[in-house]
């Protein structure tokens, strides 16, 4: 058993069928010594008397909300949750694996800049009865400070039958250092409660890996003169990380035409302009990466041929 | 050319073999964001390997103010990853395939600390402790990781010279 | 936890072979790499040999005509032996414990120690 | 092989009070490229293994009281007891574990005034 917060405690099980389960003793918080009873939840059957209540947790059932009381007041509040334990693998049943890199990713994260600020999010089809707190750092043995928010309710989507909750938190490292090589990977970890079940999820990831960058912008056609041929030009976005000169992107161009089957030109430039053929019905999109590191390329911006 | 005496090094050169870099780099080892290093107890080898920090100058105002601490610091980088190319990690069984870059990438390591300390110009004695004996099973997840390492250790490195061959270039 | 511990006989006479064995527990020979160190009664500290997690070995230049140091995984025992000893081999041997990593480590866990006198 | 010589051989030093012990190698021990000095100090109680204290150079091993620190580097290092306890009497001993075969300094014999 450890204490997650105040009045707060995980009971780690091993779950299967006839588990012995875990004795925990529970203290009243109180300098009182004699009638005190102890009760659970809502209920009013008492529980046991005395400063300390010793319990066998084993199932859910015997988790919750334990209440020591002295004459009709409430002296303090023990709320227990379990943590299980399943042939040795910690449950995950709270998140859904996105699957995305790899297999058991519950958390992904990115970040669109090397200032040390990323966002993580996460699925779960669970839409009640849950709470979510976010902690991370930079190394594990010697941990530097990263900040991050409260988790929200980002996105909503209907799969199927089901209903898919995300859920994301940003995050900003305290003293990050935008120009340097990292050598510690920052490492995020997420507790979720779900009624009285607890789980922890964790990711770990250097802020080079999870470069995503935002779309080209400003993106333009200026058509050549006596040519099908048209310059497209586009800028760095905003969130990119300044100097462009020392923190470069590349792009690639494309021009699809309208059908997905029709074959698709593709140009890699370090420029931030190109000359391409437009054909009629076509769309010309850009996407970057950064230049020297072969992170996440961005979402394509896009502009019609006409 | 880079001197100890603090003269500017050939940016336009070093941005272009830097880039090269980045390029052998990854085309060494292209897979290798889908693999999670750290599943393998990587803190060891990251650990053992250089890193240009914080404090290096190799940041857009380091490199106004002196980009001498931050060269030197990317030429023992440069030398170090250059002997770890040329151990019996690299060298050794299981055979690289013929055509595999790590060749070109040891060369061009070798060319870009060269190209920053010519012959005759000496920071200091490069050392690096003896390398741990490996054996074949041990040497693809330390090539892998020494790799990996490399791609971002010659990310950092690109920058500064293409910052430089835009920013400090006579 | 992580524990090394050292056994065998603790007199040898002059010119046989002496042999030791170091039984561990608490972490992964893949991970580890496991040293013989010797220390003569009041005096200082001298390394004998390793034998690295791919099961290769080094011996110190001044030993390694005399010194073999074997592993059986399945046991998770490591052995020295040391042939043709004399009085200047009486010593507490001891083994240790560096992580392996590119580079040779320093020793973080080692076994209480065994004396072992060379005596007729 | 390097040669590992620590002075002095041996200190005595009142309690409270501050021990300084110094070990020097025949070639440096620090690595360029990765700026580690590979030494690492140990402390030896009568009937017991050395135990380590600090590794590379600076970083104190966990557990070791913090009185307990590391420095210097290439060719210089250093040990530093800040205020002496009864129960740090004991060898001292450097190892450098740069290349091999290991080496340990001779000992230092620290012991209360």
């Known amino acids: 058993i450890w204490e997650l917060k105040k009045d707060v405690y995980v009971v780690e099980l091993d779950w299967y069928p006839d588990a012995p389960g875990e004795m925990v003793v529970l203290t009243c918080d109180t300098p009182e010594e004699d009638g005190i009873t102890w009760t659970l939840d809502q209920s009013s059957e008492v529980l046991g008397s005395g400063k300390t209540l010793t319990i066998q947790v084993k199932e859910f059932g015997d988790a919750g909300q334990y209440t020591c009381h002295k004459g009709g007041e409430v002296l303090s509040h023990s709320l227990l949750l379990l943590h299980k334990k399943e042939d040795g693998i910690w449950s995950t049943d709270i998140l859904k694996d996105q699957k995305e890199p790899k297999n058991k990713t519950f958390l992904r994260c990115e970040a669109k800049n090397y200032s040390g600020r990323f966002t993580c999010w996460w699925l779960t089809t669970i839409s009640t009865d849950l709470t979510f707190s976010v902690k991370s750092s930079r190394g594990s043995s010697d941990p530097q400070g990263v900040t991050c928010g409260a988790a929200t309710l980002s996105a909503e989507r209907v799969r199927g039958d089901n209903k898919e909750y995300e859920y994301s938190v940003e995050c900003q490292e305290d003293s990050a250092c935008p120009a340097a090589e990292e050598s510690l990977p920052i490492e995020v970890m997420v507790d979720a409660v779900h009624k009285l079940k607890y789980e922890n999820y964790t990711s770990s990831f250097f802020i080079r890996d999870i470069i995503k960058p935002d779309p080209p912008k400003n993106l333009q056609l200026k058509p050549l003169k006596n040519s099908r041929q048209v310059e497209v030009s586009w800028e760095y976005p905003d969130t990119w990380s300044t100097p462009h000169s020392y923190f470069s992107l590349t792009f690639c161009v494309q021009v699809q035409g309208k059908s997905k089957r029709e074959k698709k030109d593709r140009v890699f430039t370090d420029k931030t302009s190109a000359t391409v053929i437009c054909r009629k019905n076509a769309s010309i999109s850009v996407r970057a990466q950064d230049r020297y590191y072969s992170s996440s390329w961005s979402e394509w911006a896009s502009v019609p041929c006409s | 050319r880079a001197v100890p005496g603090g003269s500017s090094p050939a940016w336009t050169q070093c941005q272009q073999l830097s880039q090269k870099l980045c390029t052998l780099a990854w085309s060494a080892h292209p897979l290798v964001g889908h693999m999670d290093l750290r599943e393998e107890g990587d803190e060891e080898t990251t650990n053992d390997v250089p890193h240009i920090q914080c404090g290096d100058g190799c940041d857009p105002q380091g490199l106004r103010d002196n980009s001498q601490f931050c060269l030197q610091r990317i030429h023992q980088g440069l030398i170090f990853y250059e002997k770890l190319l040329g151990s019996d990690i690299f060298t050794g069984e299981p055979s690289l395939l013929p055509d595999s870059p790590v060749g070109q990438l040891h060369a061009s390591l070798l060319g870009l600390s060269q190209l920053l300390q010519p012959e005759g110009h000496h920071w200091e004695t490069q050392q690096i402790p003896s390398l741990s004996p490996s054996q074949p099973w041990q040497r693809l997840l330390l090539r892998f990781k020494i790799l990996r390492s490399l791609q971002a250790f010659v990310a950092v490195a690109a920058r500064v010279f293409a910052h430089g061959a835009a920013t400090l270039s006579p | 936890q992580v524990q090394l511990q050292e056994s065998g006989p603790g007199l040898v006479k002059p010119s046989e072979t002496l042999s030791l064995t170091c039984t561990v527990s608490g972490f992964s020979l893949i991970s580890y790499n496991v040293h013989w160190i010797r220390q003569p009664p009041g005096k200082g500290l001298e390394w004998i040999g390793v034998?690295?997690?791919?099961?290769?070995?080094d011996y110190n230049p001044s030993l390694k005509s005399r010194v073999t140091i074997s592993v059986d995984t399945s046991k998770n025992q490591f052995s020295l032996k040391l042939s043709s000893v004399t009085a200047a081999d009486t010593a507490v041997y001891y083994c240790?414990?560096?992580?392996?990593?590119?580079?040779?480590?320093?020793?973080?866990?080692w076994g209480q120690g065994t004396l072992v006198t060379v005596s007729s | 092989d390097i040669v590992m010589t620590q002075s002095p051989d041996s200190l005595a030093v009142s309690l409270g009070e501050r021990a300084t012990i110094n070990c020097k190698p025949s070639?440096?021990?620090?690595?360029?490229?990765?700026?580690?000095?590979?030494l690492a100090w140990y402390q030896q109680k009568p009937g017991q293994p050395p135990k380590l204290l600090i590794y590379?150079?600076?970083t104190r091993q966990s557990g070791v009281p913090d009185r307990f620190s590391g420095s210097g580097s290439g060719t210089d290092f250093t040990l530093t007891i800040s205020s002496l306890q009864a129960e740090d009497v004991a060898v001292y001993y450097c190892?450098?574990?740069?290349?091999?075969?290991?080496?340990f300094g001779q000992g230092t014999k620290l012991e209360i005034k």
């Open positions: 190892l450098q574990h740069f290349n091999y075969p290991w080496t």
């Open positions: 590379y150079a600076s």
């Open positions: 070639q440096s021990l620090l690595s360029s490229g990765n700026r580690k000095n590979y």
């Open positions: 034998i690295w997690t791919g099961g290769s070995t």
């Open positions: 240790a414990r560096d992580k392996y990593g590119l580079f040779p480590g320093y020793f973080d866990y």
